[in-house]
């Protein structure tokens, strides 16, 4: 089977996942693939235990998210529907920016240094935090 | 010992087809995204194709893409890379390498000792 | 797309010098680079990751420094094995680039 049943070594089980925090920095789409390569995604919040959860590991750093609105409507890497889903958002966010002067506005979400969520232009190196979740009915051995 | 051995190179004519394998040895082969790197005769590297661990994610190099397709058995501890549509300038040694990472840093850390691909008529 | 300048992309020393080694990238990749060895015939192998970390089992004569956009690889004191060619590498967009330098030829004076 091609299902985990435990995390990979130097990520952390919480509720049925795994998460592995960066402690560098990468634009959106880099560590987009930088969690697809790992089997991966970036990190979806699904609800306020979650949301609380990523917040104590990241700390006040700002960190991407796997949401974006690159292709118009707010998206959720995973497919998780964002308009019925838990959001977090700062007030007044998001607000697609424009006054950045890097061109265009802000379309990738991050957690921001008090966890509440922000959109920001995606080519900006922040850190990043990859999920994948774990399955019950595999039959591959842990990953060591 | 950590080990990737490739095989499958050979003399294939324009447009034709040929499919590599890489036997990985000695770590867990599904742990790690691998790689396919290759070096045309005096030349420098180029990356050509990436692969996630359990096979979910692959990539391609613009120069490639479309025509090769690399995939895995991990099962058999094997990579492959199946190369269709060649052309003269797919002529190199092809290396498949290991990603590792530490930290966030991404590197191949350990690389096969190639096999050589010549297409020509 | 990010592109990664070597030079010089030849080098003449003897054994015993102190010999460097330059890459820049066209824009910032902070410390996301890596130095690898080639010697003819045989498959590159890692020297150094995240542009200053030495990998396991390489000798200490050998250190990557620099971030943003320019970085050096320094042999402090050459040896005789050390005569191959360097590529560097970034990794801050890997994939779906993986960049290599065109490579630097260490060649015996």
């Known amino acids: 089977g091609s299902e985990r049943t435990c995390c990979p070594v130097n990520w952390v089980e919480h509720e049925r996942s795994c998460y592995w925090f960066s402690r560098s920095g990468k634009a959106w789409a880099d560590a987009d693939n930088y969690c697809r390569l790992e089997d991966a995604h970036l990190v979806v919040v699904t609800s306020w235990e979650e949301q609380k959860f990523v917040q104590h590991h990241i700390g006040p750093v700002n960190t991407w998210m796997g949401l974006h609105d690159q292709n118009g409507p707010w998206k959720w890497v995973d497919g998780t529907d964002y308009e019925t889903g838990f959001k977090n958002w700062r007030p007044e966010q998001p607000d697609d920016w424009y006054g950045h002067g890097l061109g265009g506005g802000e379309d990738c979400a991050h957690f921001t240094d008090d966890g509440r969520w922000n959109d920001d232009v995606c080519q900006r190196p922040y850190r990043w935090v990859c999920e994948t979740e774990l399955d019950k009915a595999s039959q591959e051995p842990p990953l060591l | 010992e950590v080990q990737l051995l490739e095989s499958g190179g050979g003399l294939v004519q324009p447009g034709g087809s040929l499919r590599l394998s890489c036997a990985a040895s000695?770590?867990?082969?599904?742990?790690?995204?691998m790689s396919w790197v290759r070096q045309a005769p005096g030349k420098g590297l180029e990356w050509v194709s990436v692969i996630s661990g359990r096979g979910g994610s692959t990539y391609y190099a613009d120069s490639v893409k479309g025509r090769f397709t690399i995939s895995r058995d991990n099962s058999k501890n094997t990579l492959y890379l199946q190369m269709n549509s060649l052309r003269a300038e797919d002529t190199a040694v092809y290396y498949c390498?290991?990603?590792?990472?530490?930290?966030?840093?991404?590197?191949?850390?350990?690389w096969g000792q190639g096999t050589m691909v010549t297409v020509s008529s | 797309d990010i592109q990664m300048t070597q030079s010089p992309s030849s080098l003449s020393a003897s054994v015993g010098d102190r010999v460097t080694i330059t890459c820049r990238a066209s824009?910032?990749?902070?410390?996301?680079l890596n130095w690898y060895q080639q010697k003819p015939g045989k498959a590159p192998k890692l020297l150094i990751y995240a542009a200053s970390s030495l990998q396991s089992g390489v000798p200490s004569r050998f250190s990557g420094s620099g971030s943003g956009t320019e970085f050096t690889l320094t042999i402090s004191i050459l040896q005789p094995e050390d005569f191959a060619t360097y590529y560097c590498?970034?990794?801050?967009?890997?994939?779906?680039?993986?960049?290599f330098g065109q490579g630097t030829k260490l060649e015996i004076k």
């Open positions: 390498a290991k990603r590792g990472i530490v930290g966030a840093t991404e590197a191949f850390d350990i």
């Open positions: 000695g770590f867990t082969f599904s742990s790690y995204a």
């Open positions: 824009q910032n990749i902070y410390s996301y």
């Open positions: 590498q970034q990794s801050y967009n890997t994939p779906p680039e993986c960049n």
